[in-house]
Interface confidence: low
């Protein structure tokens, strides 16, 4: 289920997965809902620890029980990842936070009068992913009032600092915000140039393009169809980045597809799940259980309601089903992407929902004059 | 609201905005998304217009103005007044709407989180009211959508202030003592919103108060709190399944 | 007691003007929906025109529209129609009504004038 | 607009009989219908709302009964006060009465 609930001077021991610097607890937990892996997450806030290295520390964690041990670290702020929380799951973040410089690739400078102002550029720059503004009363002078634009590698701060007048934040482009605009067309047989930031196996194209979207470096993305000739890159996903922000040249290619992340869509962005089943295909993962289960789409409810659960398979071989219930493989990765696709098998395949956000799972816990 | 700000987009997506076409249209009252089928709102906004048809509610806006012909709306499939309320008091001023058809959630169109039954440990400290209504008291309706920070004042010191009112529990009250910052009319039925470890929750309706930002006459408010119980019966027995964000 | 009293029918002719006035007691005025129904003689009834609690929007059956005017003066507790235009099957009895129960929703009318005729004949 | 049509038009009934009258709206008003006694010269008198929801100080032997399209209200025992027009009247969308049921003595 859904737990929001936040322990104060609370640390999780054991089970790190990742670790990267947020400027607050609650963009700490956001990066841990979309983590494939990660069901708890634990912050150092800056008054909580002397060890610069580790101020502003997010720590992402995954259990096989789904919890960890706590204990007790003053300032420290741990919870649960809103995996399962519905409407909850969003990874757009508004807060802006003062005194506190945002460190990355400073990749354009300018002079603005605002910071709602530097976030609205950073929103409207395609490769902006943080930035930070310098105050009318920062101590030197000539930055005042410079909107400098950042991304990393990873999409969060390489260091986050404390500073006085200066005041930091994240792109809105998750929030829908963006006045870029996107590309919705999908072209088919062409395959798109320039670097690759990560590789998945992914069964469609649309699936391939909505983590595009959600991966923080991603601008665009080339699919392998299952029939391309290289056997061992079908159903392979490159998501692509290039320092123009769109491909730099493009290649006609039989059984390739290609596109852009919807990132910068104005208005709507596509969920950050995949609810399509996938009749015929295996997806293969680590072993996370195995139920008897009466349909495909109890089957996808299963792993939708097992929090580690990221994809599913489904089989309907003889011997897997017992009258009318069949078994129900529930499996995971390291990236949350099967490490496997068949084709041609005896059942169908698919994807938790638990990142859907329009389900009704989510949870929150915790006369004179009318007008 | 009296002395707010303009709103952005999708700062406060749970809230829509109830109006009625009748020759012409308008804004009558707000209310708050809680779930893909139900609005939380005030009942004094049907005081007098009980007839569903004409009810339209716009989610996912900002700006009034931008409303056109073409402008999807839901309409009122039920309206559920509280069974106590009665139209020449301000007691227990809250109604349940539901949509004839489902919405589906956006960065611009979701719910807001309800607190938990009977909440009163929870301290509040930041709280901000919603709404399109007037920015004075003789004033007109916003067409920007309008926030306001504005604390939380005790039951003991507003009923202080309402002398001729009794304010109880199931009511919470927000002002500055040197007023100039409150809800007004047309924000009725609209939220009274607190953020809360990083959460956000529905404290309160839009319900009344002495004029609009008063000194020493805060705004009056539902406690959303005190009605748990009937928001989770009349949401679940109408279709057996629980539809709003409703505490664990 | 609750009471509402209606006055200002007669007689007119066809194409002329009444204003007719219903005055309320015993319940806040200002609180409530207020109606206007009437009935033709030896005919049923048909509801003609609302107005809402602040007086700000109104309502209207279509054969009255344009011609009818509902109002209020919530300080005088005082609901009034204005009949202009008046044709000859406008003759009827006009009553006025509200809702007196606190759930607005339930919008039947449970409390009625005794009623002011109206005869529109040359 | 939506319509409302009552049947019958005149109903003959003695004493202590059961008496049914149907209301037909054109559409759906879900449960927003209300009935109405009327005596000559007098204000009709509201009886039931919400198709079976008994005003307060309305004899018991009044019930109300339907949803959607289709309407009844029934007398279970006729008394002599009974003889009367009856309407119903929808108000989902605006207010429309039906034409009227008058009850007459058999």
């Known amino acids: 289920g859904c737990l929001t609930q936040l322990y104060e001077n609370a640390f999780f021991r054991g089970g790190d997965v990742a670790s990267m610097y947020t400027p607050n607890a609650q963009y700490c937990q956001m990066r841990c809902t979309f983590h494939p892996r990660c069901l708890l997450f634990s912050f150092l806030p800056a008054s909580s620890i002397n060890d610069m290295e580790k101020r502003f520390g997010c720590f992402l964690k995954d259990s096989v029980t789904g919890t960890l041990p706590k204990v007790h670290r003053t300032g420290a702020v741990s919870g649960h990842s809103l995996k399962q929380c519905g409407h909850q799951i969003s990874a757009c973040h508004r807060d802006i936070y003062k005194g506190v410089d945002m460190r990355g690739v400073n990749f354009n400078v300018s002079k603005v009068s605002s910071v709602e102002e530097c976030q609205k550029r950073c929103t409207s720059n395609i490769r902006c992913q943080f930035f930070s503004y310098a105050t009318q009363t920062f101590h030197k002078a000539e930055y005042r009032n410079n909107c400098l634009l950042k991304y990393s590698p990873g999409g969060t701060p390489t260091a986050i600092k404390v500073l006085s007048n200066v005041e930091s934040g994240f792109s809105l482009k998750p929030c829908a915000l963006s006045e870029i605009g996107c590309h919705m067309n999908i072209f088919q047989h062409l395959a798109f140039s320039d670097v690759d930031v990560a590789r998945v196996l992914t069964p469609d194209a649309f699936v391939c393009r909505t983590i595009c979207t959600y991966h923080p470096n991603c601008l665009f993305f080339t699919f392998y169809t299952n029939v391309w000739k290289i056997e061992s890159q079908r159903n392979v996903c490159l998501l692509k980045t290039s320092e123009s922000g769109t491909p730099s040249s493009s290649t006609p290619q039989e059984n390739t597809i290609s596109g852009y992340s919807l990132l910068t869509c104005k208005r709507t962005l596509p969920e950050p799940c995949h609810s399509k089943i996938y009749p015929g295909v295996d997806f293969g993962g680590e072993e996370l259980n195995v139920t008897f289960v009466k349909g495909v789409n109890v089957c996808q409810e299963t792993c939708t309601k097992m929090i580690r659960c990221q994809f599913f398979t489904y089989s309907l071989l003889p011997e897997d089903c017992k009258e009318e219930k069949c078994k129900c493989f529930l499996r995971l990765s390291m990236d949350g992407s099967p490490t496997r696709i068949a084709y041609g098998t005896q059942g169908s395949s698919g994807y938790s929902l638990r990142l859907c956000n329009t389900g009704d799972n989510s949870v929150c816990t915790t006369k004179t004059s009318t007008r | 609201i009296v002395g707010g700000t303009n709103s952005s987009w999708g700062e406060w997506p749970w809230q829509v905005s109830l109006q009625v076409k009748l020759t012409a249209q308008r804004h009558l009252c707000g209310g708050s998304l809680i779930g893909h089928q139900w609005v939380l709102t005030a009942a004094h906004c049907f005081d007098g217009l009980p007839l569903q048809d004409v009810w339209r509610i716009y989610s996912g806006i900002l700006n009034l103005s931008d409303i056109t012909k073409d402008t999807p709306f839901s309409q009122i499939k039920e309206i559920i007044i509280h069974q106590n309320y009665k139209v020449s008091e301000g007691n227990h001023d809250i109604a349940l709407i539901k949509l004839q058809a489902p919405l589906n959630y956006t960065e611009f169109q979701k719910p807001i989180c309800l607190p938990s039954k009977g909440d009163t440990s929870t301290i509040y400290t930041n709280c901000w009211v919603t709404g399109w209504g007037f920015s004075k008291e003789k004033g007109e309706i916003q067409n920007i959508l309008q926030k306001v920070n504005i604390p939380l004042v005790t039951n003991e010191e507003c009923q202080k202030r309402y002398q001729d009112y009794k304010i109880t529990q199931r009511m919470v009250c927000a002002g500055y003592k040197e007023g100039g910052k409150d809800a007004c009319k047309g924000d009725s039925g609209g939220p009274l919103v607190c953020k809360h470890n990083g959460m956000w929750r529905l404290v309160g309706i839009t319900s009344w108060g002495e004029g609009c930002a008063r000194r020493e006459q805060p705004g009056v408010y539902t406690k959303v709190a005190e009605y748990m119980d009937w928001i989770l019966e009349k949401t679940q027995s109408s279709d057996g399944k629980a539809q709003m964000q409703s505490p664990a | 007691e609750v009471q509402l009293l209606e006055s200002g029918g007669g007689l007119v002719q066809p194409g002329g003007s009444l204003r007719l006035s219903c005055a309320a007691s015993g319940f806040t005025f200002s609180h409530y929906i207020m109606m206007w129904v009437r009935q033709a003689p030896g005919k049923g009834l048909e509801w003609v025109s609302g107005i809402y609690s602040s007086g700000g929007i109104t309502v209207y059956a279509d054969s009255v529209k344009g011609r009818f005017t509902i109002s209020r003066d919530n300080s005088k507790n005082t609901l009034y129609l204005q009949m202009n235009s008046l044709r000859a099957e406008d003759t009827a009895v006009y009553y006025c009504a509200y809702r007196r129960t606190g759930v607005p929703r339930w919008d039947a009318f449970d409390i009625w004038g005794q009623g002011t005729m109206v005869t529109v004949s040359s | 607009d939506i319509q409302m049509t009552q049947s019958p038009s005149t109903l003959s009934a003695s004493v202590g009989d059961r008496v049914t009258i149907t209301c037909r709206a054109s559409q759906s008003i879900s449960s927003w219908l209300a009935w109405y006694q009327q005596k000559p010269g007098k204000a009709p008198n509201l009886l039931i709302y919400?198709?079976?929801t008994l005003e307060s100080g309305v004899p018991s032997r009044f019930s109300g009964s339907g949803s959607g399209t289709e309407f009844t209200l029934t007398i279970s025992s006729l008394q002599p006060d009974d003889f009367a027009t009856y309407y119903c009247q929808q108000y989902n969308t605006y207010w429309t009465f039906g034409q009227g049921t008058k009850v007459e003595i058999k």
């Open positions: 919400k198709a079976s």
